[in-house]
Structures are given as structure tokens and as C-alpha cells.
């Protein structure tokens, strides 16, 4: 999906209002120094691409983020503020239902959510406004 035509300011507002708090809840009890941020993004569409990937794509050691509250709210925000996003996600959702597993908060998941917080921070405050 090409995130170029999303309403970035509306997504930012959704993040600041609710998603950020859910990420904090997920990370509660974890020190900010515990993980190094290795994932970066260069502009707002790129940040959303990386955010989508880390939030919804299962990775080795962390297969369960998509069912977390912050993930569901992220999905809702993208569906509302990114034209045509919902349609592209139908197949992905169906595939995800088939491999649903019980929720387990692993250290790998915590590290992944720490990366997500950095990506969202970058998305919210790109230094160059043409982004």
C-alpha cells in the first residue's frame, strides 16, 4: 500500500490521543534504555510503511502484536485516514485469522514495540515539512 495520500495530521492526532497510551501500557515495566532503536524511516509515508510492517507482520519471536489494542487502533486510523487502505487489508486479515495464536508478550515483542515508538515519534515530527 502507498501511504502517500493519507491524512497525516489526522493519523498523528489519533496516535497522540490514544495509540501512544496503549503502547505505553504494553511497555509498562520496561526501561527506556533496554532496547536500541535500529529501525528508522525517512519521511511520513515511509514511516507508516515501517509502522504497518512492524505492527501487523509476524516476525521471528513475536507473532502476536496484531491483536493488541494499539494495533487495532492503528489499523482503524489507517483505514479511516488512508484512502483505499481497508481494501488492501482484506486478504491480509483473512490470512492472519488462520494463524492466530495465544497472546504472549515476549522480550522480542517488547523490543519491536520499542522500535514502533521510535517510528511513531519520527512520523509525528518530521523536521522537513514537505514530508
Amino acid at each position: 500500500y502507498d501511504f502517500t495520500n493519507c491524512d497525516f495530521e489526522k493519523i498523528k492526532a489519533a496516535y497522540l490521543s490514544t495509540i501512544s497510551k496503549d503502547l505505553i501500557t504494553y511497555m509498562s515495566g520496561t526501561k527506556s534504555t533496554e532496547f536500541n532503536n535500529t529501525v528508522s524511516c525517512s519521511n511520513r509515508p515511509h514511516c507508516l510503511t515501517e509502522i504497518q510492517s512492524l505492527t501487523f507482520n509476524p516476525t521471528a519471536g513475536c507473532a502476536s502484536l496484531a491483536k493488541e489494542m494499539f494495533a487495532m487502533k492503528t489499523k482503524a486510523a489507517l483505514a479511516i485516514w488512508c484512502p483505499g487502505y481497508s481494501e488492501t487489508q482484506i486478504n491480509a486479515t483473512q490470512a492472519m485469522k488462520k494463524r492466530r495464536k495465544r497472546k504472549v508478550t515476549t522480550n522480542k515483542c517488547l523490543e519491536q514495540v520499542s522500535q514502533l515508538q521510535g517510528l511513531w515519534r519520527r512520523f509525528n515530527r518530521p523536521l522537513l515539512k514537505q514530508q
Epitope: 521510535g118 511513531w120 515519534r121 509525528n124 523536521l127
Partner: antibody
Framework: EVQLVQSGAEVKKPGSSVKVSCKAS????????MHWVRQAPGQGLEWIGA????????SYNQKFKDRATLTVDKSTRTAYMELSSLRSEDTAVYYC?????????????WGQGTTVTVSS | DIVLTQSPATLSLSPGERATLSCRAS??????????MHWYQQKPGQPPRLLLY???NLGSGIPARFSGSGSGTDFTLTISSLEPEDFAVYYC?????????FGQGTKLEIK
């Protein structure tokens, strides 16, 4: 807890340059915008610019665009602000400040300030 | 550039009194229903300290006697009952539009 420690006071001649450092300890360094703000004696706060350590991208107040250069060294978790062609009006306390956790644009961690005096 | 005008320039009050500080922006600092206006307190020889973010949210460790309100172009910082340590200079700051700008400050002094 995140701390920003700045380099010591500087006395410079008009026309010269000054380079102020700001070393971060604790927390994550690369994904927080780092800003520079100055305050002339008895005056208010003036934004100089910001840098994103992740890729070195910068944004400047137009007033300082030709004279200020912001850089970072990720390996030492240090941000730098260099100001060239100094004049007496540049006499001020220079602060580095880290942007907040969420990208809301406020500064929740500040350095202690570096006094730069420009005098012939 | 967005100009932030703070008033009054100096406010003389006694401990226990209520303080009301104003910050007016030359254009709206709102975006998608959020107000990107922040407030700081600065004491002599110290860096500024965050008081309130996004107009009305208390910064970490800030006492509940501080509160903020407003949207669009008009914002207010209120200190319900002044403590001796509250006498300082207060700055508003906007981040909605580059360049980031600060108000000129309001000095809160003991009467």
C-alpha cells in the same frame, strides 16, 4: 533517566566560530529530535534549529540558516551546534533540548546551558 | 512566522493569590483538534522546565495548582494558589508551524 551535559563556557572574538557540544546519557538517542535554543542576557528564548540523529536531517530557523551548523556523532551520543561569523549580539546562553517521547514538540529534557561571550 | 504575545509582561502578586497568564498567537496553533501550545517555567541561572504540554496537560512532576486552557489563538496558564517557588519567568511555545517560536515571557514577581 535521560541527561544532557553541555560543554563549558566560551569567550570568542567577533568574526570567529564556536562549537558547543551536548552529550546524552540514558535513554535512546537516535530517534529523538534534538533542538538548540539560545537566550541572550535578560532576554527570551530563541529557537536555532533541530537535528534528527537517526539520519542527520536538520531544520533551521531562517535567521540562523547561513551561520549555524548542527551535527551529531551517534557513536558518542553527542550533538553539536557550531555558530560562525560571531558578533556581539550572539552573546547568550545556548541550550540543547530533547524533544518529547511522542513527537508532540515540547522539550522535556534540557542541557544545563553553555555561556558564549563574544567580545573584542 | 507565528508570533506569540504574552501578557502581562510582569505580574506582581503575593503568595496564596491566583495567577492568570495569557499567550496569544498570531494564527491558530491547532491541528486536527489538538492545540500544539506548550508552557515552561524558568528560574534565574536554570534552563526552562516544562509545565504544560498541548495547552492543558501537566508535565511530569508538575503540581496540580498549575493548569492550562485555550485553543486556536488564545491560551491561558493559571496557578491557583501561588507558592514562593512559583515566582519565575513563564514562556509559551508553539510547534504547529515552523519555525518553532516562543513568547517573550511573563515575569511573575512577589508583590
Amino acid at each position: 533517566e535521560v541527561q544532557l551535559v553541555q560543554s563549558g563556557a566560551e569567550v570568542k572574538k567577533p568574526g570567529s566560530s564556536v562549537k558547543v557540544s551536548c552529550k546524552a546519557s540514558g535513554g535512546t538517542f537516535s530517534t529523538y529530535n534534538m533542538h538548540w535554543v539560545r537566550q541572550a542576557p535578560g532576554q527570551g528564548l530563541e529557537w536555532i534549529g533541530a537535528i534528527y540523529p537517526g539520519n542527520g536531517e536538520t531544520s533551521y530557523n531562517q535567521k540562523f540558516k547561513d551561520r549555524a551548523t548542527l551535527t551529531v556523532d551517534k557513536s558518542t551520543r553527542t550533538a553539536y551546534m557550531e555558530l560562525s561569523s560571531l558578533r556581539s549580539e550572539d552573546t547568550a546562553v545556548y541550550y540543547c533540548a530533547r524533544e518529547d517521547d511522542y513527537g508532540e514538540g515540547y522539550f522535556d529534557v534540557w542541557g544545563q546551558g553553555t555561556t558564549v561571550t563574544v567580545s573584542s | 512566522d507565528i508570533v506569540l504575545t504574552q501578557s502581562p509582561a510582569t505580574l506582581s502578586l503575593s503568595p496564596g493569590e491566583r495567577a492568570t497568564l495569557s499567550c496569544r498567537a498570531s494564527e491558530s496553533v491547532d491541528n486536527s483538534g489538538l492545540s500544539f501550545m506548550h508552557w515552561y517555567q524558568q528560574k534565574p541561572g536554570q534552563p526552562p522546565r516544562l509545565l504544560l504540554y498541548r495547552a492543558s496537560n501537566l508535565g511530569s512532576g508538575i503540581p496540580a495548582r498549575f493548569s492550562g486552557s485555550g485553543s486556536g489563538t488564545d491560551f491561558t496558564l493559571t496557578i491557583s494558589s501561588l507558592e514562593p517557588e512559583d515566582f519565575a519567568v513563564y514562556y509559551c511555545q508553539q510547534i504547529n508551524t515552523d519555525p518553532l517560536t516562543f513568547g517573550q515571557g511573563t515575569k511573575l514577581e512577589i508583590k
